[in-house]
């Protein structure tokens, strides 16, 4: 708490300007009116204040708005936003995308802080869903934002928002998240032609089921190995050697380098060795010729 002391003669602030630049902590507290500060918040960002001075200004706003700042003040917080705690931010009602952008701009270059995470959470909850404009904004500032959401949170993303997602936005997504995003992407891009569709859907294929991979194998897509290695193992296992060959096209040669890694390793174990030999890559570990393969999972399903 800052001690309450009378403002020295001639030091009362008539406006927020650089005359306050070297005010001591107690002078700022005594000489700056909180209501004046609230109406001229935009000026604070044009004045280099020390962190101690910013703490005083924040304290004044906290006293004026104990239930949380109005959006007119929040939008102009600028550098002062970095002094806010998640608890402060939980009191806010931020509805304008412009306000969100202004505050994210302040935090640019920093990691996503607890303050920013709380701000985004408040904003998205207030909107009810992650619409395209919001997602556009968030992924522009934080490419990994989408992958920081739980599958439950991702379920509120409308398919139309998927158009805003760039491949790098999905780099850190795990299979559970891609399981949620893939059907949305499939829906979003459904009216595109084959090659264009593949370019757009490629980053989401870590959530694709077997039947969709089989369908892609009929379209000469030439999937690269990096994409193939990110596919769900359970979706790759039922694919035949011919289907994988068609799916990868000229990239099929890359299977040799990945034969010890999932999902290639597990897929090889499920294929007949003579089928693997047709690829001419020297892949080993398939089912020897003459062996009978029983699909016990199918038998259990029937019983």
């Amino acid at each position: 708490e800052v001690e309450k002391t009378a403002c020295p003669s001639g030091k009362k602030a008539r406006e927020i300007d650089e005359s306050l630049i070297f005010y001591k902590k107690w002078e700022l507290e005594a000489c700056v009116d909180a209501a004046l500060l609230a109406t001229q918040m935009d000026r604070v960002n044009a004045i280099p204040f020390t962190y101690e001075q910013l703490d005083v200004l924040k304290h004044k706003l906290d006293e004026l708005y104990p239930q949380g700042y109005p959006e007119s003040v929040i939008q102009h917080l600028g550098y002062l936003f970095l002094k806010m705690s998640p608890e402060d931010i939980r009191k806010w009602n931020v509805t304008s995308l412009e306000t969100l952008k202004a505050l994210l701009e302040v935090n640019k270059g920093h990691e996503m802080s607890p303050q920013v995470a709380t701000l985004i959470d408040r904003f998205v909850k207030g909107r009810g869903q992650l619409d395209k404009d919001t997602l556009d904004t968030l992924t522009a500032f934080y490419p990994g934002y989408l992958c920081s959401l739980s599958p439950e949170e991702l379920s509120s993303v409308p398919p139309s928002s998927i158009w805003a997602v760039r491949p790098q936005d999905l780099d850190t997504c795990d299979p559970r998240q891609l399981d949620v995003l893939y059907p949305k992407a499939r829906l979003a891009f459904q009216n595109m032609n084959g090659s264009e569709y593949f370019v757009k859907i490629q980053s989401f294929l870590g959530g694709a089921p077997t039947e969709d991979l089989k369908a892609l194998s009929q379209q000469n897509v030439s999937m690269d190995l990096a994409t193939f290695m990110k596919l769900r193992t359970d979706a790759v296992l039922p694919l035949t050697v011919a289907e994988v060959q068609k799916l990868l096209g000229p990239h099929v040669e890359g299977l040799k380098a990945e034969e010890r890694h999932r999902p290639v390793r597990d897929w090889i174990l499920r294929q007949r060795q003579d089928d693997l030999d047709t690829l001419g890559l020297g892949l080993q570990g398939g089912i020897p010729n003459g062996y009978l393969v029983l699909d016990l999972s199918m038998q259990e399903a029937l019983s």
């Epitope: 650089e18 630049i21 070297f22």
Partner: antibody, heavy 119, light 106 residues
Framework: EVQLLESGGGLVQPGGSLRLSCAAS????????MSWVRQAPGKGLEWVSA????????YYADSVKGRFTISRDNSKNTLYLQMNSLRAEDTAVYYC????????????WGRGTLVTVSS | IQLTQSPSSLSASVGDRVTITCRAS??????LAWYQQKPGKAPKLLIY???SLESGVPSRFSGSGSGTDFTLTISSLQPEDFATYYC?????????FGGGTKVEIK
């Protein structure tokens, strides 16, 4: 090009005076607070003085208060440091530094000018 | 506020990971900057707000800490990194600098 260039350093006797200048270019000079920072030979950095963008507010380290005066001429994009009653302990390289727009770190420095106070 | 840097000097080889610490006599939040100074040259800003990398500074430099204890790390020392490093607080006036840490070639 964004730069700061100090001048006016030299040898002066104890009790004497000297005026340092710092010519700024490549940025809107009047929009930024400016500072003088000094470094005695073989020693660390010491903040000496600062001035607001318009020149209306100034600050001095206790070690120079009452002896040094900081000022600026925004029409000439120039910062000044008038040094009076100089002492041997004022011997240092004096750097002019631009203050960040939002808070008090220095994002641009001049190359410095040497002030030697000796009889 | 006094800033104490340690060590005051250190010897290291190219490729080494180097860590310099700066301790404040009282809490300063994240109001700390780091500068690099080479002999006969002006200081150059590396890090501000304790951990934000100044534009154009190589990513091998990083800063961390909050309150009273701060660290500057050079992940893989390069020949051009041999210099003296200073921390500076901007929590309150007067602004103060640490005493410096000289990084020399082993």
């Amino acid at each position: 090009e964004v730069q700061l260039l100090e001048s006016g350093g030299g040898l002066v006797q104890p009790g004497g005076s000297l005026r340092l200048s710092c010519a700024a270019s490549g940025f809107t000079f009047s929009s930024y607070a400016m500072s003088w920072v000094r470094q005695a030979p073989g020693k660390g950095l010491e903040w000496v003085s600062a001035i607001s963008g318009s020149g209306g507010s100034t600050y001095y380290a206790d070690s120079v208060k009452g002896r040094f005066t900081i000022s600026r001429d925004n029409s000439k994009n120039t910062l000044y440091l008038q040094m009076n009653s100089l002492r041997a302990e004022d011997t240092a390289v004096y750097y002019c530094a631009k203050v960040d727009r939002t808070t008090w770190y220095f994002d641009l420095w001049g190359r410095g000018t040497l002030v030697t106070v000796s009889s | 506020i006094q800033l104490t840097q340690s060590p005051s000097s250190l010897s290291a080889s190219v490729g080494d990971r180097v860590t310099i610490t700066c301790r404040a006599s009282q809490g300063i939040s994240s109001a700390l900057a780091w500068y690099q100074q080479k002999p006969g040259k002006a200081p150059k800003l590396l890090i501000y707000d304790a951990s934000s990398l100044e534009s154009g500074v190589p990513s091998r430099f990083s800063g961390s800490g909050s309150g009273t204890d701060f660290t500057l790390t050079i992940s893989s020392l390069q020949p051009e990194d041999f210099a003296t490093y200073y921390c500076q607080q901007f929590n309150n006036y007067p602004l103060t600098f640490g005493g410096g840490t000289k990084v020399e070639i082993k």
